[in-house]
């Protein structure tokens, strides 16, 4: 069976939107009006992995682009990147672990924990126009809470 996917945008708990920053990075900033068109639309695929009521494994691809968020070690540190894939083979139900995030719902907010690196989360900073990254702390000054907005296909 084909993998189930939905299109969505994400905003952090400060209401910052996510946009492209160079070819292989995302950044977070406040957008208004026409600028909202800059925000990236994700194709969120529901993939194989450890699942529970509030924890669902997903892959986050960029809609109509052969780019997926992935988690890899760089200089011995878990790092978030946008990785190019062969569009003929992705998305798929059994995604490699580096592409998998545990979507965790808590109090109507979403967290995205790396399946490859437990307790590391997709994070943004309080500051404007700074990169989205993989952070190893929750509840500190880095932001790990997001809301999801559905986008029609």
């Amino acid at each position: 069976a084909p993998v189930r996917s939905l299109n969505c945008t994400l905003r952090d708990s400060q209401q910052k939107s996510l946009v492209m920053s160079g070819p292989y990075e995302l950044k977070a900033l406040h957008l208004q009006g026409q600028d909202m068109e800059q925000q990236v639309v994700f194709s969120m695929s529901f993939v194989q992995g450890e699942e529970s009521n509030d924890k669902i494994p997903v892959a986050l691809g960029l809609k109509e682009k052969n780019l997926y968020l992935s988690c890899v070690l760089k200089d011995d540190k878990p790092t978030l990147q946008l990785e190019s894939v062969d569009p003929k083979n992705y998305p798929k139900k059994k995604m490699e672990k580096r592409f998998v995030f545990n979507k965790i719902e808590i109090n109507n907010k979403l967290e995205f924990e790396s399946a490859q690196f437990p307790n590391w989360y997709i994070s943004t900073s309080q500051a404007e126009n700074m990169p989205v990254f993989l952070g190893g702390t929750k509840g500190g000054q880095d932001i790990t809470d997001f809301t999801m907005q559905f986008v029609s296909s």
Epitope: S21, G22, Q126, A127, P131, Q141
Partner: antibody, heavy 118, light 107 residues
Framework: EVQLLESGGGLVQPGGSLRLSCAAS????????MFWVRQAPGKGLEWVSV????????RYADSVKGRFTISRDNSKNTLYLQMNSLRAEDTAVYYC???????????WGQGTLVTVSS | DIQMTQSPSSVSASVGDRLTIICRAS??????LAWYQQTPGNAPKLLIH???SLQSGVPSRFSGSGSGTDFTLTINSLQPEDFATYYC?????????FGGGTKVEIK
Amino acid sequence: EVQLLESGGGLVQPGGSLRLSCAASGFTFSKYFMFWVRQAPGKGLEWVSVISPSGGMTRYADSVKGRFTISRDNSKNTLYLQMNSLRAEDTAVYYCARVGYGGNSDYWGQGTLVTVSS
Amino acid sequence: DIQMTQSPSSVSASVGDRLTIICRASQSINRWLAWYQQTPGNAPKLLIHSATSLQSGVPSRFSGSGSGTDFTLTINSLQPEDFATYYCQQADSFPLTFGGGTKVEIK
């Protein structure tokens, strides 16, 4: 008054190491991104590295990637740049700078000179 | 990486002149552009951020304009203390990059 004071520069041989420090005062250091920017003698400005307030996010210029490491100690209000495998082309005045809105450098230190020569 | 090109690289002008410096980005950087002034032996000083916003304490004779790829710094009525080197810097994406600088000399 915002103040940034770099130290640790000096003469080092190619292949050697140096650790720069930047002591910050006059603002809440733990809330700000910080940069290192360098300027070779008689040349323009080159961005070197950035670190987020928590230290969780760092980025480097390609020219220093794998050789330099940026870090910070928020309890000491201090920014660091560990520089390894130094090359002649790393000779420059190194400035630390506070990051302002959207990624500009709104306050700068006076700089510390690093000379890599045999 | 985004390349930033400044022109002219140097210019001679007189006190009271109106001066325009141009900065071009190799791709759109929206409005994420800053301008700095540097005098010999000193650290750079932020003049303009977000392409058009005057940094606190900077005289109003300095102004910035532009968006996308083309930006200008204008100094209305040059003062003796304005003879310096000016740099633009893009903050749209890492690695951050600076223009090569424009040296403003006394004619």
